[in-house]
């Protein structure tokens, strides 16, 4: 699987999950989140050659098409597969509120 | 929706479904399929700017991150959303066999 366990410990050139830290204030302009100040969101990057973690029948076909037509702009793309939530704390007035933000952290990628 | 109805009738620069015809023999090297000779597979292409048909909370965050950090390599990617099957005919000996290939045709795209 193209997950953090594999990708963070290898020098994989093809589609894999990469490290990315997002600072809520600096990178998103969100000043109201109290904790955390930012988080390891990660992102997906890398080419999707034929047979590399292909998601559907279509992505297999497209990767094969791409192999036969190397100059084509049609190719599978490396995108998130498994996403995890992130708990945040913010203040509503002086009262702290905990909220679970769904689908915020990339754990693995796929070629789609 | 970034579907064939909208995308094929517009000059949309952002993520949208584009026309692509795949010839089984020429483009994939598949000589065994009797009918059809090829099909309109389509593909997804175009940038995924902030607010453009974003798939998950994560893709919204990443697009916003990208807006604040234009040089970053982390950005959502335009990939298939709705896929449709394709019926094919091939011969097993002299007996024609009809098979439904699932997820073969792109009907719409999303930013993931």
């Amino acid at each position: 699987a193209l997950d953090t366990n594999y990708c963070f410990s290898s020098t994989e050139k093809n589609c894999c999950v990469r490290q990315l830290y997002i600072d809520f204030r600096k990178d998103l302009g969100w000043k109201w989140i109290h904790e955390p100040k930012g988080y390891h969101a990660n992102f997906c990057l890398g080419p999707c050659p034929y047979i590399w973690s292909l998601d559907t029948q279509y992505s297999k076909v497209l990767a094969l098409y791409n192999q036969h037509n190397p100059g084509a702009s049609a190719a599978p793309c490396c995108v998130p597969q498994a996403l995890e939530p992130l708990p945040i704390v913010y203040y509503v007035g002086r009262k702290p509120k905990v909220e679970q933000l769904s689908n915020m952290i990339v754990r693995s990628c796929k070629c789609s | 929706a970034l579907d064939t109805n909208y995308c094929f009738s517009s000059t949309e620069k952002n993520c949208c479904v584009r026309q692509l015809y795949i010839d089984f023999r020429k483009d994939l090297g598949w000589k065994w399929i009797h009918e059809p000779k090829g099909y309109h597979a389509n593909f997804c292409l175009g940038p995924c700017p902030y607010i453009w048909s974003l798939d998950t909370q994560y893709s919204k965050v990443l697009a916003l991150y990208n807006q604040h950090n234009p040089g970053a390599s982390a950005a959502p990617c335009c990939v298939p959303q709705a896929l449709e099957p394709l019926p094919i005919v091939y011969y097993v000996g002299r007996k024609p066999k009809v098979e439904q290939l699932s997820n073969m045709i792109v009907r719409s795209c999303k930013c993931s």
Epitope: L28, W30, V92, G93, R94, K95 | L64
Partner: antibody, heavy 121, light 111 residues
């Protein structure tokens, strides 16, 4: 420049629902909280609740809990406020207003022009 | 809910007068070194306009004749020299507690 443009006046019957829209421009819609405030004729201001467009997070005034729903469409930078089971005392001007952004509950620096909702049988 | 009591509810004044409006919160609105109190101006048929935020900070574009002061439960909005365009209703607002609440308003009329 920042602009919040609201939908037009509505006349509704008691028991019906109303959905008011607020189209934002001139700033990053998903980076600030959007509030809804109402004002009955000749009365003061009353905060109804708020939504953070990027996440869909909401905080509602308990007075309206269960009767109000705030949503957004980030593709069009539009916020919506739906109020159900309307009564005659819901007759008011409804405003959307952008929070200044340091906190969830905050001061509001830009306001829509207001939408008059009249509830009458 | 935190109750916000404004006084007076209305006042008559002349151009050039110094005008003071007070707002009392039913409990302290101080937190983390800030006073979570704001002031707005509203003219008939128009939306409110933010004048002062966090008790004493002048909103961008607001004339310097407007000022705010106070902490804890007692706050003041002062207009140093009333101008014709200042005749309006003024509201205070707290955001220390959910729900956010406004004062009942002070109407400033021409004498």
């Amino acid at each position: 420049q920042v602009q919040l443009v609201q939908s037009g006046a509505e006349v509704k019957k008691p028991g019906a629902s109303v959905k008011v829209s607020c189209k934002a421009s001139g700033y990053t819609f998903t980076s600030e909280w959007m509030n809804w405030v109402r004002q009955a004729p000749g009365q003061g201001l009353e905060w109804m609740g708020q939504i953070f467009p990027a996440l869909g997070s909401t905080n509602y005034n308990e007075m309206y809990e269960g009767r109000v729903t705030m949503t957004t469409d980030t593709s069009t930078s539009t916020a919506y406020m739906e109020l159900r089971s309307l009564r005659s005392d819901d007759t008011a001007v409804y405003y959307c207003a952008r929070g200044i952004g340091n906190y969830a509950l905050d001061a509001m620096d830009y306001w829509g022009q207001g939408t008059l909702v009249t509830v009458s049988s | 809910d935190i109750q916000m009591t404004q006084s007076p509810s209305s006042l008559s004044a002349s151009v050039g007068d110094r005008v003071t409006i007070t707002c009392r919160a039913s409990e302290s609105v101080d937190f983390y070194g800030n006073s979570f109190m704001h002031w707005y101006q509203q003219k008939p048929g128009k939306a409110p306009k933010l004048l002062i935020y966090l008790a004493s900070n002048l909103e961008s574009g607001v004339p310097s004749r407007f000022s705010g002061s106070g902490s804890g439960t007692d706050f003041t909005l002062t207009i140093s020299s009333l101008q014709p365009e200042d005749f309006a209703t003024y509201y205070c607002q707290q955001n220390i507690e959910d729900p956010l609440t406004f004062g009942g308003g002070t109407k400033v009329e021409i004498k």
